[in-house]
C-alpha cells in the first residue's frame, strides 16, 4: 500500500487483510460513487479471518491470524487506521487470540465475539472502550462460534451461525447489554459458517457461508418483529469467508472462497428490487477479509 495521505472523500468501503496463498496486509477502499479503488497503508502484520468496524471515523482491524510460509499465528491484536493520516496504530490487545472473529459496535464500544485460538473455539466475548483503550470480558455466548456473523440492531448484538468445533451451525443468539446476557433466537433455515451478516432496514441478513458440505449463495433475513427468517434472492456466486457491509441502503459482499477459487467479485443487493448485481472486482481474489464503511 501507499504511504501518502489518503484523499479526503465521503463514504468508502474499506477491505483489510484477507487470504490468498497466505495472509495479506492490504488495505484498500472502494468508492461506490465512482467505482474506483484506493490503495492505502498496509496492515503492520498480515492477517486473515479478521473483522473490521468503524468507531468515531476510525477503522479498526480486530483479531484474525497470520498464516504465512513462516508459520501460523492467531492474533489478539486490535489496530486502528486513521483515514485522515493514512496510518495504522496499535491499540490494546484482546484477552485471547481470535481467528475467524465477529465484531459489532454498540454505543461506540467494540464487541469481539467468538473466534478460535488453535483448536480452542471461543464462546467468550469482550468489549473494547476506545476512550480508555481497554478490553473487558462480558457474558459468554451460549455456543462456541468461529466464523460467526455478528450484527447490531436496536442496540442488541446478534451472533449468527458459525462453527463450534464439531458442527456448523444454523443457531443464532442475541446479547442484551443492559442485562449482560445472551438468549437464543430463531435458528436460520440454513446451516451457515463463514457467512456475511449485516443489518439493513430493521432486518438481519445472512449471506452465503458454508454448510459443512458446500459453499452457499442463498441469503436469508431475520425480522426481529416476527422473529422469522425468510429467504431473499440468492447471490450470483457461492461464497464463504466473505466480507459484507451496508452502504447507502444496499448490501455489498466482497470476495470469499467458493470451494475452488478465491473470489475477487463484489456483489450488491438492492432490497427494493430483491436483486444482486456485480458492481466491481477487488484488485485480487481473497477470502477472510475485514470490511467496514467510513462514517459520513
Amino acid at each position: 500500500g501507499s504511504m501518502g495521505h489518503a484523499p479526503k472523500v465521503g463514504r468508502l468501503i474499506y477491505t483489510a487483510g484477507g487470504y490468498f496463498r497466505q495472509s495479506l496486509s492490504y488495505l484498500e477502499a472502494y468508492n461506490p460513487s465512482d467505482g474506483t479503488w484506493l490503495d492505502l497503508a498496509d496492515l503492520q502484520v498480515p492477517r486473515s479471518g479478521l473483522a473490521g468496524c468503524v468507531v468515531g471515523g476510525l477503522l479498526y482491524a480486530v483479531g484474525g491470524r497470520n498464516n504465512s510460509p513462516d508459520g501460523n499465528t492467531d492474533s489478539s491484536a486490535l489496530d486502528c487506521y486513521n483515514p485522515m493520516t493514512n496510518q495504522w496504530s496499535p491499540c490494546a490487545p484482546m484477552s485471547v487470540p481470535r481467528n475467524r472473529i465477529g465484531v459489532g459496535v454498540i454505543d461506540g464500544h467494540i464487541y469481539a465475539v467468538g473466534g478460535s485460538h488453535g483448536c480452542i473455539h471461543h464462546n467468550s466475548v469482550e468489549r473494547y472502550e476506545p476512550e480508555r483503550d481497554e478490553w473487558h470480558l462480558v457474558a459468554p455466548m451460549l455456543t462456541r462460534r468461529i466464523g460467526v456473523g455478528v450484527a447490531v440492531l436496536n442496540r442488541l448484538l446478534y451472533a449468527v451461525g458459525g462453527f463450534d468445533g464439531t458442527n456448523r451451525l444454523n443457531s443464532a443468539e442475541c446479547y442484551y447489554p443492559e442485562r449482560n446476557e445472551w438468549r437464543m433466537i430463531t435458528a436460520m433455515n440454513t446451516i451457515r459458517s463463514g457467512a456475511g451478516v449485516c443489518v439493513l432496514h430493521n432486518c438481519i441478513y445472512a449471506a452465503g457461508g458454508y454448510d459443512g458440505q458446500d459453499q452457499l449463495n442463498s441469503v436469508e433475513r431475520y425480522d426481529v418483529e416476527t422473529e422469522t427468517w425468510t429467504f431473499v434472492a440468492p447471490m450470483k456466486h457461492r461464497r464463504s469467508a466473505l466480507g459484507i457491509t451496508v452502504h447507502q441502503g444496499r448490501i455489498y459482499v466482497l470476495g470469499g472462497y467458493d470451494g475452488h477459487t478465491f473470489l475477487d467479485s463484489v456483489e450488491c443487493y438492492d432490497p427494493d428490487t430483491d436483486t444482486w448485481s456485480e458492481v466491481t472486482r477487488m484488485t485480487s481474489g481473497r477470502s477472510g477479509v475485514g470490511v467496514a464503511v467510513t462514517m459520513e
Epitope: 488453535g118 483448536c119 458440505q213 470451494g259
Partner: antibody
C-alpha cells in the same frame, strides 16, 4: 465405503517436481479438511500440509513451505499435492488423510504413494 | 513446535498382557490428542481421538486417558492382531506433530 486413493508417486531427481493426487469416494472432500502426511522409510509420521474447505486456507510444515502446494477440486472430489524443488529428504510414502469424525484426528487414510527422490 | 515424546520406543509383551504406552507433550495440548495403530506396509488406523474417545469399530480393549500433558494408550488384554507400531498425535497447535512411535512386539 469411504476410500482415499493416492497416485502420482514415483522416482524423481533432486530439484524435480511431482504432483500427487488423492481421489475420494464414499464422502465429499468439500465436507472435510484434507491433509497430507508422509513417512520416510523406516521412520515415523510427519504432517505435511492441509487445506480448509470453508476458507480455502492452506497450512504447511516448515520443511515443505514454499515448495509444496496443496489444492482441492471439489468437482472431481480430488485433492492434490504439487511438490517442487524436491530433495532427497522428501523421500517417503505420502498419505492423503481426512478428519471426518473429529476435527483433530484422521479417521480416513489412503493407502499411500511412494515418492523417491534420487539421482 | 510442540514435541510429543513417546515411550517406550519398543516393548515386548505376550498375548493377554496389559500394555501401556505414554506420550508427553512439551506444553499444554488440551485433549487434542489422537492415537493410531500401524502395521508394516499399511496406512495408520485411528484408535482414539480427543485423548479418550474410542473410534467407531475399535475394540473396547483399547482406551486412552489424559493427565495434564501426559497421554496414555492402554491395551487391556493384548491380542495377536495388536502387534504393531503405535503413534500419538497432537493437533492442538500448528503444526500438528506425532510421537516417534512405539513398536509392540511378541515376547
Amino acid at each position: 465405503e469411504v476410500q482415499l486413493v493416492e497416485s502420482g508417486g514415483g522416482l524423481v531427481q533432486p530439484g524435480g517436481s511431482l504432483r500427487l493426487s488423492c481421489a475420494a469416494s464414499g464422502f465429499a472432500i468439500s465436507a472435510s479438511s484434507i491433509h497430507w502426511v508422509r513417512q520416510a522409510p523406516g521412520k515415523g509420521l510427519e504432517w505435511v500440509a492441509s487445506i480448509d474447505p470453508e476458507t480455502g486456507e492452506t497450512l504447511y510444515a516448515k520443511s515443505v513451505a514454499g515448495r509444496f502446494t496443496i489444492s482441492a477440486d471439489t468437482s472431481k472430489n480430488t485433492a492434490y499435492l504439487q511438490m517442487n524443488s524436491l530433495r532427497a529428504e522428501d523421500t517417503a510414502v505420502y498419505y492423503c488423510v481426512a478428519p471426518r469424525v473429529d476435527l483433530y484426528a484422521a479417521d480416513a487414510w489412503g493407502q499411500g504413494t511412494l515418492v523417491t527422490v534420487s539421482s | 513446535d510442540i514435541q510429543m515424546t513417546q515411550s517406550p520406543s519398543s516393548l515386548s509383551a505376550s498375548v493377554g498382557d496389559r500394555v501401556t504406552i505414554t506420550c508427553r507433550a512439551s506444553q499444554s495440548v488440551s485433549s487434542a490428542v489422537a492415537w493410531y495403530q500401524q502395521k508394516p506396509g499399511k496406512a495408520p488406523k485411528l484408535l482414539i481421538y480427543s485423548a479418550s474417545s474410542l473410534y467407531s469399530g475399535v475394540p473396547s480393549r483399547f482406551s486412552g486417558s489424559r493427565s495434564g500433558t501426559d497421554f496414555t494408550l492402554t491395551i487391556s488384554s493384548l491380542q495377536p492382531e495388536d502387534f504393531a507400531t503405535y503413534y500419538c498425535q497432537q493437533s492442538y497447535s500448528f503444526p500438528s506433530t506425532f510421537g516417534q512411535g512405539t513398536k509392540v512386539e511378541i515376547k
